[in-house]
């Protein structure tokens, strides 16, 4: 039975971003988010 | 030119107080988020926290929660780090900074505006 493996060779790098909510919007409060690879995801 | 000032450094004893004011002049105060960072010895800039540009939101690291606030006065185009609580470990030069608007709080590259800083011991 063969085993596959992914081994994509490069770490994906994950850092939390916060935003403040007034400057997208009206709202109070802070946004919290995650970027992984450059991208902001949530 | 936006121009950033810091003062209020100084020596105290652990479980002391301190506060610290940035005054900001060259630009127009209520379109500059502002924060606060501090640099250790051999370490890294690292955030401490921030204010929006409204002043009715903030946020903090989770290392000074609860024992630093962040205030601005519009009028006097000044914010203030309220430093209670002082640990040994908040001993570092401490620098605000001012970001543009839609830009993350908590990373280094969201701020395009840096004052000198200034020195906080904390002696035990």
């Known amino acids: 039975d063969a085993e596959f493996r992914h081994d994509s060779g490069y770490e994906v790098h994950h850092q939390k971003l916060v935003f403040f909510a007034e400057d997208v919007g009206s709202n109070k409060g802070a946004i919290i988010g995650l970027m992984v690879g450059g991208v902001v995801i949530a | 030119e936006v121009k950033l000032e810091e003062s209020g450094g100084g020596l105290v004893q652990a479980g002391g107080s301190l506060r610290l004011s940035c005054a900001v002049s060259?630009?127009?105060?209520?379109?500059?988020?502002m924060g606060w960072f501090r640099q250790a010895p051999g370490k890294e800039r690292e955030f401490v926290g921030a204010?929006?540009?409204?002043?009715?939101?903030?946020y903090y690291a989770d290392s000074v929660k609860g024992r630093f606030t962040i205030s601005r006065d519009g009028a006097k185009n000044t914010v203030y780090l309220q430093m209670n609580s002082l640990k040994d470990e908040d001993t570092a030069v401490y620098y605000c900074a001012g970001r543009p608007a839609g830009t993350a709080i908590n990373i280094r590259r969201s701020y395009n505006y840096w004052g000198q800083g200034t020195q906080v011991t904390v002696s035990s």
């Open positions: 060259g630009g127009t105060f209520s379109s500059i988020g």
């Open positions: 204010i929006s540009r409204s002043g009715d939101s903030t």
